[in-house]
Interface confidence: low
Amino acid sequence: EVEKTACPSGKKAREIDESLIFYKKWELEACVDAALLATQMDRVNAIPFTYEQLDVLKHKLDELYPQGYPESVIQHLGYLFLKMSPEDIRKWNVTSLETLKALLEVNKGHEMSPQVATLIDRFVKGRGQLDKDTLDTLTAFYPGYLCSLSPEELSSVPPSSIWAVRPQDLDTCDPRQLDVLYPKARLAFQNMNGSEYFVKIQSFLGGAPTEDLKALSQQNVSMDLATFMKLRTDAVLPLTVAEVQKLLGPHVEGLKAEERHRPVRDWILRQRQDDLDTLGLGLQGGIPNGYLVLDLSMQEALS
């Protein structure tokens, strides 16, 4: 806390300029009017203040706006944003995408911080949903942003926003998130032709149900093994050997290398060994010839 001291004669700041870098902390406190600072915040960034001096400037703004800064000030915070705590940011009402971009730019190249996370939360909650422009902005700065949202939060993403999503944006998504995103992607890309559709939908297929995988197997898509390994196990299990062969096309040979890993391992256990042998890959572990396969899940559902 800086003590209140009178401003020395002739030192009262008329504007925010470079002369202030020679002011001691107490002089900044005493000689810079908070209202002047608020109206000339855009100049602060161009002046090489020390961290200690920035602390004083923040303190002045905090006193002027105890309920939270107005957006006109927030937009021009620049490096002063790095001095804000999540508690400070929770008081803000940020509605302009330009403000969000300006602050994200300050943090560019750094890891996502609690301050930025709080800022984004405040912004998205204020908007009510993740529109395409917001999603474009956030994923440009933080490719992992989409996968940081809970399934409940993702449900507010409109299908139109899905066009902004790049494959790398989904790298850290887990199955529950893809369950929410996949139907939106299906809707967003529904008017595309076969091969173009597959290119777009491929990253979302970790949320696809069996029926959709069966449909894809009829379209010569040649799914790669990396995509296949990310499919839901429960969606893969009902696929026949012929369907998997069609789905993977020339990549079917890759099943051998993955035979001990899910979902391939569990799928093998559900297939007749005779059918697996038709692939000529030496896959082992299928149901031996002459064994009867009971669908216990159907029995459980009836009981």
Epitope: S113, P114, C147, T172, R176
Partner: nanobody, 125 residues
Framework: QVRLVESGGGSVQAGGSLRVSCLVS????????VGWFRQAPGKEREGVAA????????YYADSVKGRFTIAQDYAKNMVYLQMNSLKPEDTAMYYC??????????????????WGQGTQVTVSS
Amino acid sequence: QVRLVESGGGSVQAGGSLRVSCLVSKLTAWRSCVGWFRQAPGKEREGVAAIYSGTGSTYYADSVKGRFTIAQDYAKNMVYLQMNSLKPEDTAMYYCAGTSIRSSCGLVRDEYAYWGQGTQVTVSS
């Protein structure tokens, strides 16, 4: 692949202190919960403490409140559990767990998708 690696642990006398650490790789660190769970022989795995990295909010089980402190070091991707005033009943395997899809945290085991291998903590009387 997301990995969580615990370190620390060991043996200590009742009333002593220990710190266990968790290195978190490839979590979406800024919206994740990282929690510490423990499992004593023959008992269910229970939640001990969790931290939400988005805001630094912390959560504790009643049995450890005031004795254990969870903290994060953002730059190093580390989460620490400082355990003071240890009791024999704190003896257990301690596991670090994480999830990248939360908007808040808790100590419900099913909410955590990623788990470490565990580190043993033994408190003798």
